[in-house]
């Protein structure tokens, strides 16, 4: 069962470059954390589309937290239509694209894909089914969309991560907003489908922000997130109308929508990794 003469080259994580420009964590709601300190911080409010002040408790919380208003604006706001195009094209690879292949310690043989930073291509590997890391995609297409360079050497995807219910691994999922749209609806419409951790197979719909449509998925019956609707109509009503469509010349066409204030449940945040 062992190969004693194997060379001791250990696959490990490389040094990760910092992410710049637009990030999916800008959609997180402000989280003061469980501690009791009173620290002035800033977060991006997806509903007002502005950086706002909040009081941080000093521990935990999430990545939508900045020391200064300027830093928050730099990371999360878009100045104008031209800048939207520019920042989308200049999007760097997510951190997890630079993690090495990690099958995890278990012994399931699940075909997955990872981005190989040496070859600069997505490649197939066998995932064991537990632990592992986020450079782990269910399809080659998904891996390419998120981690490979586009035709001009640019990255074009934003991203999110979710807890994969089948094998309890952290699996990257694309949460790219199509470049012709800006989203101003409920923040959970930007989250990936999350089937949850139970064993049922219920027919549900989620809003796919990559293609701007509601799509069916199988819900396990528990857990998951708010991007989960019993009908396509309900899904469209909640999420589709949250988009403002941009004309290619930079003008805006507003689609009709009701600005109904909605509470975001904690479950929404839990699909994101707190410390990447």
């Amino acid at each position: 069962d062992s190969e004693e003469d194997e060379e001791h080259t250990i696959i490990t994580d490389t040094e990760l470059p910092p992410l710049k420009l637009m990030h999916s964590f800008c959609a997180f709601k402000a989280d003061d954390g469980p501690c009791k300190a009173i620290m002035k911080r800033f977060f991006f409010n997806i509903f007002t589309r502005q950086c706002e002040e909040f009081i941080y408790g000093g521990c935990e919380g999430n990545q939508n937290r900045f020391e200064s208003l300027e830093e928050c604006k730099k990371m999360c706001t878009r100045d104008n239509a031209n800048r939207i195009i520019k920042t989308t094209l200049q999007q760097e690879k997510p951190d997890f694209c630079f993690l090495e292949e990690d099958p995890g310690i278990c012994r399931g043989y699940i075909t997955r894909y990872f981005y190989n930073n040496q070859t600069k291509q997505c490649e197939r590997f066998k995932y064991g089914g537990c632990l592992g890391n986020m450079n782990n995609f269910e399809t080659l297409e998904e891996c390419k969309n998120i981690c490979e360079d586009g035709p001009n050497g640019f990255q074009v995807d934003n991203y999110g991560t979710q807890l994969n219910a089948v094998n309890n691994s952290l699996t990257p999922q694309s949460t790219k907003v199509p470049s012709l749209f800006e989203f101003h609806g409920p923040s959970w419409c930007l989250t990936p489908a999350d089937r949850g951790l139970c064993r049922a197979n219920e027919n549900r719909f989620y809003y796919n922000s990559v293609i701007g449509k509601c799509r069916p998925f199988k819900y396990s019956g528990c857990g998951g997130n708010e991007n989960n609707f019993t009908s396509k109509q309900e899904c469209l009503r909640a999420c589709k109308k949250g988009f403002i469509q941009r004309i290619s010349k930079g003008g805006l066409i507003k689609t009709k929508r009701k600005r109904k204030k909605q509470r975001v449940k904690i479950a929404y945040e839990e699909i994101f990794v707190k410390n990447m």
């Epitope: 062992s2 190969e3 696959i11 099958p103 310690i105 278990c106 219910a165 309890n168 857990g223 839990e270």
Partner: antibody, heavy 125, light 107 residues
Framework: QVQLQQSGPGLVKPSQTLSLTCAIS??????????WGWIRQSPGRGLEWLGH?????????SYAVSVKSRITINPDTSKNQFSLQLNSVTPEDTAVYYC???????????????WGQGTLVTVSS | DIQMTQSPSSLSASVGDRVTITCRAS??????LNWYQQKPGKAPKLLIY???SLQSGVPSRFSGSGSGTDFTLTISSLQPEDFAVYYC?????????FGQGTKVEIK
């Protein structure tokens, strides 16, 4: 019966490197059905997983973010053991260090089923 | 990382008592939870894995239950050798994390 025997110094000076070894009997460090980890325990932090290595046609590892820049876990197949190196230690690294085996890997319910006896490492000048 | 919170942090009980320790995860971990027992100067010992499966050689008075975020370890009739510290551990997400421990003391 799997047994893990730890060895290494109990006192390390600040900024130096903590080095511990875990000798395995009753299993192989390069077994495809196991993974080998280090966990530490201190009053302030409780039980804290530091990292593990495992062999699946090649060697892999995974490290805790809190120590990632300072830690190395290496196998020694000739001696059937694995080691922990933690660089640039501070008094906060004072803890009891345990090596352990991840078991249950074939079933997907994973757990630390065998542990070393523990080594109290004090970081002090 | 997933935070694991045990309660109570300590409890006093008598031999023969039924003891319940709870463990709460900061997010859904399905049934990916283990329980360990640790005695002074010793390494932790696996009691229960996968929420409810008893490790070989562990007395049947130990049982585990729960799912999602809330889990329970029960000792149906406390024995003198059961006075120890008990830890839960989640493995639903990398990194694996442990609870802070529950000390079971003699009343």
């Amino acid at each position: 019966q799997v047994q893990l025997q730890q060895s290494g110094p109990g006192l390390v000076k600040p900024s130096q490197t903590l080095s511990l070894t875990c000798a395995i009997s009753g299993d192989s460090v390069s077994s495809n059905g196991a993974a080998w980890g280090w966990i530490r325990q201190s009053p302030g932090r409780g039980l804290e997983w530091l990292g593990h290595i495992y062999y699946r046609s090649k060697w892999y590892n995974s490290y805790a973010v809190s120590v990632k820049s300072r830690i190395t876990i290496n196998p020694d197949t000739s001696k059937n053991q694995f080691s922990l190196q933690l660089n640039s230690v501070t008094p906060e690294d004072t803890a009891v260090y345990y090596c352990a085996r991840w078991g249950g890997i074939h079933d997907g319910d994973i757990y630390f089923d065998y542990w070393g006896q523990g080594t109290l490492v004090t970081v002090s000048s | 990382d997933i935070q694991m919170t045990q309660s109570p942090s300590s409890l006093s009980a008598s031999v023969g008592d039924r003891v319940t320790i709870t463990c709460r995860a900061s997010q859904n971990i399905s049934n990916y939870l283990n329980w360990y027992q640790q005695k002074p100067g010793k390494a932790p010992k696996l009691l229960i894995y996968g929420t409810s499966s008893l490790q070989s050689g562990v007395p049947s008075r130990f049982s585990g239950s729960g799912s999602g975020t809330d889990f329970t370890l029960t000792i149906s009739s406390l024995q003198p050798e059961d006075f120890a510290v008990y830890y839960c551990q989640q493995y639903g997400n990398n990194p694996t994390t442990f609870g802070q421990g529950t000390k079971v003391e003699i009343k």
